[in-house]
């Protein structure tokens, strides 16, 4: 049975408005490959309705699809050598709970200093998103740069 | 208190449903780095229900949160020529009220020869978006390869 | 008249969920570009709800303006690599009925190994979408790295 | 007031070791990525090292590459440099230096160095 | 990596003229990442400019930078005795970042 035809009586508020849209607030410490975020008017154009930030990282709060999409732009760009700080690579996945980690979401920065991608993924209300970045390259935290938001689509 | 319980007894149309895609119509004149767009069922498939478009420019009807997307292609180019040409940069921002310029989301080509990108950010009526390219690289206009367009998620 | 207006007496149903995300099965035989997608919950995070395949392409069931995403990585790929099978390309389009055959969005691998994009576009009840690479390169099958989706936006 | 503060140079005899400390006060010593940058005597500057704010990434010049190890420790607002297999062409002047909050590779503020000699 | 030369080695100009000091790149790096340092002597480099254009924090106004692509240029309008000193260019966008050797500013 089509979703809708039986929430149709429910409260708009039932259908979900969840969306997040975070900026990077700092690296991890040695062998924590995790950027960590943070969101808030206060803090510009970032802000969270529905999911929370747990240490960093992005909690939903509402079971459903949704659309996760990132950009990690790097501080300074591999050299056209590229090999000297090739593999810097991006991955987003849920890593809580453990029972439900995987990776959803992965692109390496090959000879580029950006990184840009979204896609539709269910998510469960408790998992916890992290984007890992691996390398030795910095990323910017511009806010134009550097950013990480999801967006409720349907239950 | 989460939107949608108080706006539960409103009709849909309060929801709103502004959505743009527009394809590139030309590149601004010298010292204007502007991208000027167009849009409507005659050129194809670009379309505007609800924004509008203010000297190829497009200006947002409904204060809400968008999720703005992009993607850039270069005419004549091979990775030799974009890195050759170096820093061709895309950024797209509010232009205007002047009081909330500030740039959304920015992205170099650097041995590519396409950009694409989207992020979330809230916009208010009135807002124009402006998308500037910077560089001596002319934007291809076929209309799979530069598009430019936002689509209203919630309030 | 702004759509809702007419449709607010209508079941949320009538909105329209219609969402897909979409895992690669395989790569056509010869002289076919297509990639073949599969879908479903027991694939993994792959899913249709309303579009459905049709040999492995994704067949359009409700009219109206939906945002199309895809991201393709290459299996066995360097920047030198993808130099030196340029060009290796990406189009997604509409390839039947054949009176509606359009390429709705397109990207070269440049020096890179992925490309991901997205855009909003007009699909009606009946079309269907290609995925069309062409190159030497073959795509990366993992599910964190290669995937195509659509989700129905407003009528 | 943003101040950085070098100490721990001197001379050294070739293929020995010495370790840098830089440190910092006036700023949030934990937000800001930190890089070592080098000047031998009558020349140009040579960047060096980086680590990141929270001391996750690093990244090295290729001339110091598996000999020199930066690191830092936040509680104590001090940013490291380890030199080990010291060679002639080390002798410089080392600053250590800090990145805009962008994590730009540039440097904003610097510290007023401390010698390193490699002499037998 | 990119190697940075700067023109002239030295230049000796009197306060009050107008200083022009040249960073030329070996290749195009990204998005006009170029800073420029000054430098006395016995003291650490200061930035003065960096985005190549924008002027740091309390750097006077008679300081401005500018160009694109390979070539950067620092302008002084009007010296003051202050202003003698090494400059150095830097650029950030292509890893390593690297430096200029400087142009040493002199009184004439």
């Known amino acids: 049975q089509r979703f809708a035809q039986a929430q149709q009586q429910l409260p708009l508020e039932s259908l979900g408005w969840d969306v997040a849209e975070l900026q990077l607030n700092h690296t991890g410490p040695q062998q924590d490959p995790r950027l960590y975020w943070q969101g808030g008017p206060a803090l510009g154009r970032s802000f969270l309705h529905g999911p929370e930030l747990d240490k960093g990282q992005l909690r939903i709060h509402r079971d459903g699809i949704y659309m996760v999409h990132i950009q990690v732009t790097l501080a300074i760009c591999s050299s056209t050598t590229a090999s000297r700080h090739h593999p810097t690579t991006l991955a987003v996945g849920i890593c809580s709970p453990a029972s439900r980690s995987i990776s959803l979401l992965r692109l390496s920065f090959h000879q580029g200093c950006t990184i840009a991608s979204q896609r539709l993924t269910p998510l469960a209300r408790g998992d916890t998103l992290c984007t890992n970045l691996t390398g030795t390259l910095l990323p910017s935290r511009n806010t134009d740069e550097t950013f990480f938001g999801v967006q409720w689509v349907r239950p | 208190q989460r939107f949608a319980q108080a706006q539960q007894q409103l009709p849909l149309e309060s929801l709103g449903w502004d959505v743009a895609e527009l394809q590139l119509n030309h590149t601004g004149p010298q010292q204007d780095p502007r991208l000027y767009w167009q849009g409507g069922p005659a050129l194809g498939r670009s379309f505007l229900h609800g924004p509008e478009l203010d000297k190829g420019q497009l200006r947002i009807h409904r204060d809400g949160i968008y999720m703005v997307h992009i993607q850039v292609t270069l005419a004549i180019c091979s990775s030799t020529t974009a890195s050759r040409h170096h820093p061709t940069t895309l950024a797209v921002g509010i232009c205007s009220p002047a009081s909330r310029s500030i740039s959304l989301l920015r992205l170099s080509f650097h041995q590519g020869c396409t950009i694409a990108s989207q992020r979330l950010t809230p916009l208010a009526r009135g807002d124009t978006l402006c998308t500037n390219l910077t560089g001596t690289l002319l934007p291809s206009r076929n209309t799979d390869e530069t598009f430019f367009g936002v689509q209203w998620v919630r309030p | 008249q702004r759509f809702a207006q007419a449709q607010q007496q209508l079941p949320l149903e009538s909105l329209g969920w219609d969402v897909a995300e979409l895992q690669l099965n395989h790569t056509g035989p010869q002289q076919d570009p297509r990639l073949y997608w599969q879908g479903g919950p027991a694939l993994g995070r792959s899913f249709l709800h309303g579009p459905e395949l049709d040999k492995g392409q994704l067949r359009i069931h409700r009219d109206g303006i939906y945002m199309v995403h895809i991201q393709v990585t290459l299996a066995i790929c360097s920047s030198t690599t993808a130099s030196r099978h340029h060009p290796t390309t990406l189009a997604v389009g509409i390839c039947s009925p054949a009176s509606r055959s359009i390429s709705l969005l397109r990207l070269s691998f440049h020096q890179g190994c992925t490309i991901a994009s997205q855009r909003l576009t007009p699909l009606a009840r009946g079309d269907t979408l290609c995925t069309n690479l062409t190159g030497t390169l073959l795509p990366s099958r993992n599910t964190d790295e290669t995937f195509f989706g659509v989700q129905w936006v407003r009528p | 007031e943003v101040q950085l503060l070098e100490s721990g140079g001197g001379l050294v005899q070739p293929g020995g070791s010495l370790r840098l400390s830089c440190a910092a006060s006036?700023?949030?010593?934990?937000?800001?990525?930190m890089s070592w940058v080098r000047q031998a005597p009558g020349k140009g500057l040579e960047w060096v090292s980086v680590i990141s704010d929270s001391g996750g990434t690093t990244d090295y010049a290729d001339s110091v590459k598996g000999r020199f190890t930066i690191s830092r420790d936040n509680s104590k607002n001090t940013l490291y440099l380890q030199m080990n297999s010291l060679r002639a062409e080390d002798t410089a002047v080392y600053y250590c230096?800090?990145?805009?909050?962008?994590?730009?590779?540039?440097?904003?503020?610097w510290g007023q160095g401390t010698l390193v000699t490699v002499s037998s | 990596e990119i190697v940075l030369t700067q023109s002239p080695g030295t230049l000796s100009l009197s306060p009050g003229e107008r200083a022009t000091l040249s960073c030329r790149a070996s290749q195009s790096f990204s998005s006009n990442y170029l800073a420029w340092y000054q430098q006395k002597p016995g003291q650490a480099p200061r930035l003065f400019i960096y985005?190549?254009?924008s002027r740091a924090t309390g750097i006077p106004d008679r300081f401005s930078g500018s160009g694109s692509g390979t070539d950067f240029t620092l302008t002084i309008s009007r010296l003051e005795p202050e202003d003698f000193a090494v400059y150095f260019c830097q650029q950030y966008g292509i890893s390593p970042c690297s430096f200029g050797q400087g142009t040493k500013l002199e009184i004439k």
């Open positions: 230096a800090r990145h805009d909050y962008s994590n730009r590779y540039y440097f904003d503020y």
């Open positions: 006036g700023f949030t010593f934990s937000s800001y990525a």
């Open positions: 985005g190549a254009s």
